[in-house]
Amino acid sequence: MMTGTIETTGNISAEKGGSIILQCHLSSTTAQVTQVNWEQQDQLLAICNADLGWHISPSFKDRVAPGPGLGLTLQSLTVNDTGEYFCIYHTYPDGTYTGRIFLEVLESSVAEHGARFQIP
């Protein structure tokens, strides 16, 4: 039975031209995390493999940086970066856990972080 939960940074906003850290945390399970995939809608942004390290998709290499931890840093944000982001935790033996983050990139200088929430 899958007992884990993923906590994410939830709904967040950031300034155009700035950067943002996408973070997820898997808790309440003893399952081994073998890989974390970061996706934007249907596009793979990056992979963090527990054994080998990070792979950043070539089309995002200039604007995506690994970490901190299993998180992902998006840089030089544009309004086109607004949308849903998913952290997909591949675990053994539980299977796959998915967390969702919604990022809004604002033209203005006021960008506030949303509340944290959990996805079972």
Epitope: T34, N49, D51, G53, H55, I56
Partner: antibody
Framework: EVQLLESGGGLVQPGGSLRLSCAAS????????VSWVRQAPGKGLEWVGY????????YYADSVKGRFTISRDNSKNTLYLQMNSLRAEDTAVYYC??????????WGQGTLVTVSS | DIQMTQSPSSLSASVGDRVTITCRAS??????LNWYQQKPGKAPKLLIY???SLHTGVSSRFSGSGSGTYFTLTISSLQAEDFATYYC?????????FGQGTKVEIK
């Protein structure tokens, strides 16, 4: 005691194929990712590829991508490396190595692959 | 790919000497750095993982330090069985890459 034992090396002509095996014992094979690492005669170490323990996804070095395929049979505690379209520059000792936390913590003794006409 | 550069490529030392080998990464790898020892005709053996953690069964005369792009392996008092080639390896960005090796020879 953790043990990895490679087999299947030998002399093959350019363009030929070879399948290497790596038999594992002394640990729960299905819990660990495993990599192949090679070493050309008198040269340094080069990572070849990796296979995940449970889902079976793989990664490869650019130098072998599309020519080499890694697979595993957890019921037999065995790892495989299928090598096709072999080139002279693939000549090396091939090691299987258990992956753990970013390092390769246990290695086999290696098997020599010679690609020559 | 991340380039790993070791120095020196070779060194001569005597039993009892303190030996330090350095490894530089072409970009930050945080602390995802491992060190291996290889003797002629044998498979490599893991000595240090995550820059400074000693692998099971490895003598405490081996130590590692560093983070970011600069790392060192130190053998506090060289023993006869330590004459070998040493490799660093990064595990921060796929593909994993190794340094070219440092051969430690008897003076």
């Amino acid at each position: 005691e953790v043990q990895l034992l490679e087999s299947g090396g030998g002399l093959v002509q350019p363009g030929g194929s070879l399948r290497l095996s790596c038999a594992a014992s002394g640990f729960t094979f299905s819990n660990y990712g495993v990599s192949w690492v090679r070493q050309a005669p008198g040269k340094g170490l080069e990572w070849v590829g990796y296979i995940n323990p449970s889902r079976g996804y793989t990664y490869y070095a650019d130098s072998v991508k599309g020519r080499f395929t890694i697979s595993r049979d957890n019921s037999k505690n065995t790892l495989y490396l299928q090598m096709n379209s072999l080139r002279a520059e693939d000549t090396a000792v091939y090691y299987c190595a258990r992956s753990y936390g970013g390092g390769f913590d246990y290695w086999g003794q290696g098997t020599l692959v010679t690609v020559s006409s | 790919d991340i380039q790993m550069t070791q120095s020196p490529s070779s060194l001569s030392a005597s039993v009892g000497d303190r030996v330090t080998i350095t490894c530089r990464a072409s970009q930050t790898i945080e602390r995802r750095l491992n060190w291996y020892q290889q003797k002629p005709g044998k498979a490599p053996k893991l000595l240090i993982y995550d820059a400074s953690s000693l692998h099971t069964g490895v003598s405490s005369r081996f130590s590692g330090s560093g983070s970011g792009t600069y790392f060192t392996l130190t053998i506090s008092s060289l023993q006869a069985e330590d004459f070998a080639t040493y490799y660093c390896q990064q595990s921060y960005i796929i593909p994993p890459t190794f340094g070219q090796g440092t051969k430690v020879e008897i003076k």
